[in-house]
């Protein structure tokens, strides 16, 4: 058993049929010594008396809010949560496996630039009695500070018969050094509590590996005289690191119709303009990627050919 | 050329060669993102590699003030990786595929380090650690980690030279 926060404790249980469970001793936070009784949740049934209460925690029915009273007055609470371990593996029932970029990916994180600011998100099908707490650091043995905000519900989607909820959190490294080569990864730890179930999820990454620039901005077309070609120009996204002579991007320019199966024109460039062939009912799209490190491409920025 | 006395390097040549290094480092190990190497006890193997750190003057302001600190750091790293790529880790079993770009990568590291420091000038170089894994699978894992680390190192070096070529070239 360990303390998650004040008056909230996590009991780690090996979860299998007829498991013996864990013996837990609760102590009432009071100078009083006599006349103390214990109850669980809303029940008025007295579970025991005395300053301490010893219980055998085996299942969710044994978890919950234990309260010690004296003469009708509440002295203190202890909330017991369960953390299940099945076949040596901690349960991951609360969050959905996003399976990208690999199986058992519960947390996904992205950064728009090298400033040390990043966003992580996760998915669940649970809509109520759900809380998250996020901590982060650079490195684990001698951790350097990363400050994370509160996790918020950022999107709701319908997937078949189920509703899916996306939560996200923004974090910022306290003393970021955008130009340096990272040697210690960022660690992100999410505590998830659903009713009386506790789970924790972790992710470890370098900012450079989660970079995904915003799409290029201000796409403009200029038809070339006596030609099917148009010159398309764009600018670096506002959110990208500066100066651009140092933090350079490379671009992919593509002309394509509505369908992915249609024919296309495609060219890669380090410049902020390119010449392509425009077709009726097609769109010109441009996306960006770090020029020197193969992290994710941005989403496409598009303008119609006409 | 960057010499210990402090003259400027051939920024444009360094830019071209460092960008080539980036391409080669990724073609030597393109699927690196699909393998979480941090789960494999990283510390004792690649913590010894020289990293370009915050105080090394490789940021745009540091380069403007005095590029020599940064160039010396990059030179140290190039020599270090050049030795690693020529070591038993890469030459031993399992043999590299004949079409592996590691050979080109090795030559390009040497080429860039020579551009930075011509014959007859000597900057301090970092001692190469004795990483000699006994098992072929350990060697394979170590190669992945070294190439992964090299990708990050040459990305910073390429940014430095691109910025230098754009803003510091005479």
């Amino acid at each position: 058993i360990w303390e998650l926060k004040k008056d909230v404790y996590v009991v780690e249980l090996d979860w299998y049929p007829d498991a013996p469970g864990e013996m837990v001793v609760l102590t009432c936070d009071t100078p009083e010594e006599d006349g103390i009784t214990w109850t669980l949740d809303q029940s008025s049934e007295v579970l025991g008396s005395g300053k301490t209460l010893t219980i055998q925690v085996k299942e969710f029915g044994d978890a919950g809010q234990y309260t010690c009273h004296k003469g009708g007055e509440v002295l203190s609470h202890s909330l017991l949560l369960l953390h299940k371990k099945e076949d040596g593996i901690w349960s991951t029932d609360i969050l959905k496996d996003q399976k990208e970029p690999k199986n058992k990916t519960f947390l996904r994180c992205e950064a728009k630039n090298y400033s040390g600011r990043f966003t992580c998100w996760w998915l669940t099908t649970i809509s109520t009695d759900l809380t998250f707490s996020v901590k982060s650091s650079r490195g684990s043995s001698d951790p350097q500070g990363v400050t994370c905000g509160a996790a918020t519900l950022s999107a709701e989607r319908v997937r078949g018969d189920n509703k899916e909820y996306e939560y996200s959190v923004e974090c910022q490294e306290d003393s970021a050094c955008p130009a340096a080569e990272e040697s210690l990864p960022i660690e992100v730890m999410v505590d998830a509590v659903h009713k009386l179930k506790y789970e924790n999820y972790t992710s470890s990454f370098f900012i450079r590996d989660i970079i995904k620039p915003d799409p290029p901005k201000n796409l403009q077309l200029k038809p070339l005289k006596n030609s099917r070609q148009v010159e398309v120009s764009w600018e670096y996204p506002d959110t990208w690191s500066t100066p651009h002579s140092y933090f350079s991007l490379t671009f992919c320019v593509q002309v394509q119709g509505k369908s992915k199966r249609e024919k296309k024109d495609r060219v890669f460039t380090d410049k902020t303009s390119a010449t392509v062939i425009c077709r009726k009912n097609a769109s010109i799209s441009v996306r960006a990627q770090d020029r020197y490190y193969s992290s994710s491409w941005s989403e496409w920025a598009s303008v119609p050919c006409s | 050329r960057a010499v210990p006395g402090g003259s400027s390097p051939a920024w444009t040549q360094c830019q071209q060669l460092s960008q080539k290094l980036c391409t080669l480092a990724w073609s030597a190990h393109p699927l690196v993102g699909h393998m979480d190497l941090r789960e494999e006890g990283d510390e004792e193997t690649t913590n010894d590699v020289p990293h370009i750190q915050c105080g090394d003057g490789c940021d745009p302001q540091g380069l403007r003030d005095n590029s020599q600190f940064c160039l010396q750091r990059i030179h140290q790293g190039l020599i270090f990786y050049e030795k690693l790529l020529g070591s038993d880790i890469f030459t031993g079993e399992p043999s590299l595929l004949p079409d592996s770009p590691v050979g080109q990568l090795h030559a390009s590291l040497l080429g860039l380090s020579q551009l930075l420091q011509p014959e007859g000038h000597h900057w301090e170089t970092q001692q190469i650690p004795s990483l000699s894994p006994s098992q072929p699978w350990q060697r394979l894992l170590l190669r992945f980690k070294i190439l992964r680390s090299l990708q990050a190192f040459v990305a910073v070096a390429a940014r430095v030279f691109a910025h230098g070529a754009a803003t510091l070239s005479p």
Partner: antibody
Framework: QVQLVQSGAEVKKPGASVKVSCKAS????????LHWVRQAPGRGLEWMGW????????EYAPKFQGRVTMTTDTSTSTAYMELRSLRSDDTAVYYC???????????WGQGTMVTVSS | EIVMTQSPATLSVSPGERATLSCRAS??????LHWYQQKPGQAPRLLIY???QSISGIPARFSGSGSGTEFTLTISSLQSEDFAVYYC?????????FGGGTKVEIK
Amino acid sequence: QVQLVQSGAEVKKPGASVKVSCKASGYTFTDYYLHWVRQAPGRGLEWMGWIDPENGDTEYAPKFQGRVTMTTDTSTSTAYMELRSLRSDDTAVYYCAANKELRYFDVWGQGTMVTVSS
Amino acid sequence: EIVMTQSPATLSVSPGERATLSCRASQSISINLHWYQQKPGQAPRLLIYFASQSISGIPARFSGSGSGTEFTLTISSLQSEDFAVYYCQQSNSFPLTFGGGTKVEIK
């Protein structure tokens, strides 16, 4: 499978014109760009231009501008390349080539030998 | 127009050996570079597109690398059917241009 079959060899006199055909099969004709590339004996490859069979749009290499015309007949899935004012240095194998991507060549015809000789 | 230069013009290699072919562009072309193989009396065949992307059906011994102005086609272990002429082609801008070719012949 995607296939391009070209017309047979031609012998032409200097100053004449030649029209080479290229019949496509195995795909929807308008779904691919069509290019013409030539190769003089013992020499390298030279791009001449492209046509979009969907709308007849063309782009020619400056070297052939004014002397070449590329057309298509969607009813027969056939592309044509006409080269006028032939000179002896136009002697070459002429290839048609196609791709869904405009700028490189995925599928090639077998080639048509055009000899220009007096 | 962009001039593509291939070297060497002829490469003599023994079967089973590795062959490295070079292609240089007269200006930076990012990764807009494609490789073809041509055997005598046949049309060219696409091997690699956008510098390093492999084509299904092309043996894995063919690989491409490079960006900017310098590109390499590597054939890791030459088979008898690989003796041919190899061309690079840039698609950075029109007109599309080819290199002069490298003939890979049996040593």
